[in-house]
């Protein structure tokens, strides 16, 4: 829409058990979810390490200007771009019992908006138009959702590139270290 | 080195059992869920049936469910499969495989053992 | 048949970018992550990409996967000879409840 735009900041959205959507069917049963040896794997294994931070839901603040055809607004608007990763349910020691997560594949999580917000824009038109007022839908939150089939592409497109784009090489444990002794750590993080 | 290794498979008539043993080497045995998946020769993969960390959560594919029968002991490092009612169709490659990751995939992968179902 | 579709086939020269699709369905695609395997000829598989995306250590930057509604693809860029190999997706699928995986693509690096 040819608008400006430039990062003012981030604010990581790191999710809790009550963010999440209600479990599906297969989740009920926890028997053995609540085991310690949730978090990083010891130093012998074979996948490197990266920070849990670096798997998060991120609220990336942009400000951009409102356009409308020629028209542009008079004062830019500031507004949330959902962005990063929700990694695997591993790394959210708070949602282990909702899922059977020692599965090879399992829930699918994004990174999308959670809620909007209006707000009324004043438009400036050239050739002495006169100003004309809008209401433009703003992205307020982020949140990791489980993706359905009412997620579909098209509206991912809308929750920022991040959402959908491969990231390069990312992997979901914490620095290695012995997987009992990690617990405490990923609890206090969350 | 991190190491699976399958053994067990063999010649047998349709209707009687194999019990096939996977020994596990080089890493926290019990920091992998393990899975058994299989191959008929010239075809795909099939996923056959996981196990968790303590061996208390199980899952099977409908096409074994009620006849194989998916069980590890930590403390020999092993995996086991009980065929029973065996079919030809369960002629396969039998791969033992592990995942140490929730929702990451088969990281870990043996060579094999093949299992012929023949009269 | 297998509940993830996939080609038979595919190829391409040294070099070039290469991309496999696999399809499924609302209950495996749609709502799980997906994982792709290569089989090398007379070897097992390995793990390629995990969590739609994610490549595990030592999985050259060549390989990325990515994840559209109900479909999902592997892209191979800068082909090599020895990328020649059966490619497959795999998913969990919440009807079957099981862990399902395309037919497989068998990848040919002509020339």
């Known amino acids: 829409q040819g608008w400006q735009a430039f990062k003012n900041d981030a604010t990581e959205i790191i999710p809790e058990l009550g963010e999440y959507p209600e479990p599906p069917p297969e989740l009920e049963n926890n028997k053995t979810m609540n085991r310690a040896e949730n978090g990083g794997r010891p130093p012998h294994h074979p996948f490197e390490t990266k920070d849990v931070s670096e798997y998060s839901c991120r609220e990336l603040h942009f400000t951009r200007y409102v356009t409308d055809g020629p028209c542009r607004s008079a004062k830019p608007v500031t507004e949330l771009v959902c962005s990063g990763q929700c990694g695997p349910a591993r790394l959210l020691p708070n949602a282990i019992g909702r899922g059977k997560w020692w599965r090879p594949s399992g829930p699918d999580f994004r990174c999308i908006p959670d809620r909007y917000r209006a707000q009324r824009v004043q438009l400036l038109c050239p050739g002495g138009e006169a100003p004309r007022a809008r209401k433009v839908r703003l992205v307020a939150s982020c949140k990791c959702k489980r993706l359905t089939r009412f997620h579909n592409q098209s509206e991912l497109k809308d929750f920022g590139t991040e959402a959908a784009r491969p990231q390069k090489g990312r992997k979901p444990r914490p620095r290695a270290r012995s997987a009992k002794a990690n617990q405490a750590e990923l609890e206090n993080a969350y | 080195e991190v190491q699976l290794v399958e053994s067990g498979g063999g010649l047998v008539q349709p209707g009687r059992s194999l019990r096939l043993s996977c020994a596990a080497s080089?890493?926290?045995?019990?920091?992998?869920?393990l899975h058994w998946v299989r191959q008929a020769p010239g075809k795909g993969l099939e996923w056959v049936s996981g196990?968790?960390?303590?061996?208390?959560?199980?899952d099977y594919a409908d096409s074994v469910k009620g006849r194989f029968t998916i069980s590890r002991d930590n403390a020999k490092n092993s995996l086991y499969l009980q065929m029973n009612s065996l079919r030809v169709e369960d002629t396969a490659l039998y791969y033992c495989?592990?995942?140490?990751?929730?929702?990451?995939?088969?990281?870990?992968w043996g060579q094999g053992t093949t299992v012929t179902v023949s009269s | 048949q297998s509940v993830l579709t996939q080609p038979p086939s595919a190829s391409g020269t040294p070099g070039q970018r290469v991309t496999i699709s696999c399809s499924g369905s609302?209950?495996?695609?749609?709502?799980?992550?997906v994982n792709w395997y290569q089989q090398l000829p007379g070897t097992a598989p390995k793990l390629l990409i995990y969590?739609?995306?994610q490549r595990p250590s030592g999985v050259p930057d060549r390989f990325s996967g990515s994840k559209s509604g109900t479909s999902a693809s592997l892209a191979i860029s800068g082909l090599q000879s020895e990328d020649e190999a059966d490619y497959y997706c795999?998913?969990?699928?919440?009807?079957?409840?099981?862990?399902?995986f395309g037919g497989g693509t068998k990848l040919t690096v002509l020339g």
């Open positions: 080089g890493f926290t045995f019990d920091d992998y869920a």
């Open positions: 969590s739609n995306n």
């Open positions: 609302s209950s495996n695609i749609g709502r799980n992550t």
């Open positions: 196990i968790n960390w303590e061996g208390d959560d199980i």
């Open positions: 495989a592990g995942n140490s990751r929730g929702y990451g995939g088969l990281d870990v």
């Open positions: 795999a998913a969990w699928d919440d009807n079957l409840e099981s862990y399902v």
